[in-house]
């Protein structure tokens, strides 16, 4: 029996053929963020919850310490949802008062640490200002993208304000990625 | 021949291959909404085009009376689109007077509903404070994520607010799922 | 040895088996756009970064000349991100005044082109009203679906400003699609 | 380990400018929002306003038109001041360390007596 | 601004015992209600937060419950070191207000 007949002509005869359930994947979920010390220059990074409720890991995907760490090399869609909440800052009255400033902004970064490279790699960014006119607000930033990971990267996501950050339910920030 | 010339030699021999375009898919667009009854404390569900223009079930994805059914147990990719419009309540000219209420908003649930489970599980919520300057305003909330979902699971979109729903176009307000 | 015994027993024994990582991806980014001619009643369509940095084509998924050249005939996942950004206009001081007028609004579209058919075809669409109260403002708009395509269509991203995208970060604005 | 400590001058005369430094380990100031309350005996806790981490400010109404919080996130500081002091304006003057709803963590206090 | 109440000032109990204590809103705060405890020297600690989570190193003695405007703090199992005064907080809009707090003494 031979390969090709289970794949089209153009296939390469040496690409392994893999059972999809055994795919790495993650999906992890929001859970209440306490201060802790980061990087100079790199917004701090979210811890998640991996294994109750709607999260998991499976198929050699682990979270460890604020990160996903990726098991095999391979194309992956990741994305990630935060939904930020807060009360209203002065900038409104600033900016009314002919003083254009810099906006109040939030943030959400998805990176990819990789051991063997001194940098992280930022991979997704939402950001968008902030100047709402009511006293409550509450957003979301959705990011999803495909990328090709090495064994062995690291993926995190990263948040301007983590004390934005909405941790009451789990549907609401959230973050995950799985092998295509 | 042996299974593992197929595989990497982490894949579990009883993992079953299959083709990849005989799996459970489905993408459907926006309907005129009308007005229907809703479990008290459950924002309503929207119905959907399930075959016209874009919109398509296939592999054994049905759509019926506003629910995707859910044929065969694995891991999904989950996503919606809703796109909202109104006016501009009184939120802002309140909050002139100097008087903060609760913001006006608007929400995006994607539920699973389990026939063998009393409650439906909130999978993924967007929700948006909505208090704009402008008359008119319009915006999309973007949700997509992976769950684990079995066999006879039925998956809904509910919105807070049936009547700004953005009908007009199939491609402002969508929903979809597809095993992976 | 027969195929049925690597696949449930649903699956059509004429469907091929193929190998994910032989199956056509893009990710592509952002870069600096220049002013084009585009078609009367479309909105300009971005050109992108398609080898440098995180973006990618591969397994004959081709980018030329703004257009992502589907390969092969199949489901794919299809998204892009435009972040834009932009000073305020007058709209807020129109409406303070009194004459409610169309709003400000940043538009993205993903299109596909089928040469055998006159008119492309929209498929998704985020657009959303600005109005913002601060001086410099930005946002970012996603999209993510699944759709049916056909060897030989085109996928581009139109935005109804393109002096408004923010072209200065691969992970602000980008543009991706795979074969499922 | 977090930490947060305030360090103010004690006494102040009436009419006078109150200025207090809280200064936090364990942390980035750039990250995550400081608030301040204060406990007089007369008005129980009571919050006065808080900086986020991208540096913007929210006050109590009551209070606004006095109050300023500014702070330096190089020196992990934190910089509440207050004109016009009363007398009931004394009170022990916390610092705290949140989420957008909650004080997590709160500094030790530090009395403030306003007095001639 | 939200008015919060605790309408008992001061409260008597012996070790072992289970202790209520109750907070009401002057409007519905959708469950964003905090619960410090205030030790005699002036520390204070965060135990609950949005309504019924309980804080990082806080025992499981303590629990919340609560809805819409009604809320409470409940200690399962009193221990001496429970004994300070113990305040709500509302965290659902500007100005944050507290209650005026539920002193528990010893028995």
């Known amino acids: 029996l031979k390969g090709q007949e289970f794949a089209p002509s153009h296939q390469q005869v040496y690409a392994p053929l893999r059972a999809d359930g055994d795919k790495p994947r993650a999906h992890l979920t929001v859970v209440r963020q306490t201060p802790t010390q980061h990087f100079k220059n790199q917004f701090p990074a979210l811890h998640w919850e991996h294994e109750l409720g709607l999260a998991f890991t499976k198929n050699r995907m682990n979270y460890t310490n604020k990160f996903l760490l990726i098991p095999e090399s391979g194309d992956y869609f990741i994305y990630s949802q935060v939904t930020f909440r807060g009360m209203t800052s002065e900038c409104s009255e600033i900016r009314q008062a002919g003083r254009p400033n810099k906006p109040d902004s939030i943030t959400v970064v998805i990176t990819k640490v990789t051991d063997s490279y001194p940098e992280p790699t930022q991979l997704l960014m939402g950001t968008k200002s902030v100047c709402e006119v009511g006293s409550n607000w509450f957003q979301p930033i959705y990011l999803g993208a495909m990328f090709s990971l090495q064994e062995g990267d690291k993926l995190m996501v990263n948040v301007s304000d983590i004390s934005l950050v909405d941790y009451t339910k789990e549907d609401k920030t959230f973050f995950g990625a799985f092998l295509l | 021949l042996k299974g593992q010339e197929f595989a990497p030699s982490h894949q579990q021999v009883y993992a079953p291959l299959r083709a990849d375009g005989d799996k459970p898919r489905a993408h459907l667009t926006v309907v005129r909404q009308t007005p229907t009854q809703h479990f008290k404390n459950q924002f309503p569900a929207l119905h959907w085009e399930h075959e016209l223009g874009l919109a398509f079930t296939k592999n054994r994805m049905n759509y019926t009376n506003k629910f995707l059914l859910i044929p065969e147990s694995g891991d999904y990719f989950i996503y919606s689109q809703v796109t909202f419009r109104g006016m501009t309540s009184e939120c802002s000219e309140i909050r002139q007077a100097g008087r903060p209420n609760k913001p006006d908003s608007i929400t995006v649930v994607i539920t699973k509903v389990t026939d063998s489970y009393p409650e439906p599980t909130q999978l993924l919520m967007g929700t948006k404070s909505v208090c704009e300057v402008g008359s008119n305003w319009f915006q999309p909330i973007y949700l997509g994520a992976m769950f684990s979902l079995q066999e006879g699971d039925k998956l809904m979109v509910n919105v807070s607010d049936i009547s700004l729903v953005d009908y007009t176009k199939e491609d402002k307000t969508f929903f979809g799922a597809f095993l992976l | 040895l027969k195929g049925q015994e690597f696949a449930p027993s649903h699956q059509q024994v004429y469907a091929p088996l193929r190998a994910d990582g032989d199956k056509p991806r893009a990710h592509l980014t952002v870069v600096r756009q220049t002013p084009t001619q585009h078609f009367k009643n479309q909105f300009p369509a971005l050109h992108w970064e398609h080898e440098l940095g995180l973006a990618f084509t591969k397994n004959r998924m081709n980018y030329t000349n703004k257009f992502l050249l589907i390969p092969e005939s199949g489901d794919y996942f299809i998204y892009s991100q435009v972040t834009f950004r932009g000073m305020t206009s007058e709209c807020s001081e129109i409406r303070q005044a009194g004459r409610p007028n169309k709003p400000d609004s940043i538009t993205v579209v993903i299109t596909k082109v089928t040469d055998s058919y006159p008119e492309p075809t929209q498929l998704l669409m985020g657009t959303k009203s600005v109005c913002e109260v601060g001086s410099n403002w930005f946002q970012p708009i996603y999209l993510g679906a699944m759709f049916s395509l056909q060897e030989g269509d085109k996928l581009m991203v139109n935005v109804s400003d393109i002096s408004l995208v923010d072209y200065t970060k691969e992970d602000k604005t980008f543009f991706g699609a795979f074969l499922l | 380990q977090i930490q947060l400590k305030e360090s103010g001058p004690g006494l102040v005369a009436p009419s006078q400018s109150l200025s207090i430094t809280c200064t936090v380990s364990g942390f980035s100031l750039s990250s995550y929002g400081v608030d301040w309350v204060r406990q007089s005996p007369g008005k129980g806790l009571e919050w006065l306003g808080v900086i986020w981490g991208f540096g913007g400010t929210n006050y109590n109404s009551a209070l606004k038109s006095r109050l300023s919080i500014s702070k330096d996130n190089s020196k992990s500081q934190v910089f509440l001041k207050m004109n016009s002091l009363q007398s009931d304006d004394s009170a022990i003057y916390y610092c705290a360390s949140g989420n957008f709803d909650a004080m997590d963590y709160w500094g030790q206090g530090t009395s403030v007596t306003v007095s001639s | 601004d939200i008015q919060m109440t605790q309408t008992t000032s001061s409260l008597s109990a012996s070790l072992g015992d289970r202790v209520t204590i109750s907070c009401r809103a002057s409007q519905d705060i959708s469950n964003y209600l905090n619960w410090y405890q205030q030790k005699p020297d002036g520390t204070v600690k965060l135990l609950i937060y949005y309504t019924s989570r309980l804080h990082s190193g806080v025992p499981s003695r303590f629990s919340g419950s609560g809805s819409g405007t009604d809320y409470s703090l409940t200690i399962s199992n009193l221990e001496q070191e429970d004994i300070a005064t113990y305040f709500c907080?509302?965290?659902?809009?500007?100005?944050?207000?507290f209650g005026s707090g539920t002193k528990l003494e010893i028995k």
């Open positions: 907080q509302q965290g659902n809009t500007l100005p944050f207000t």
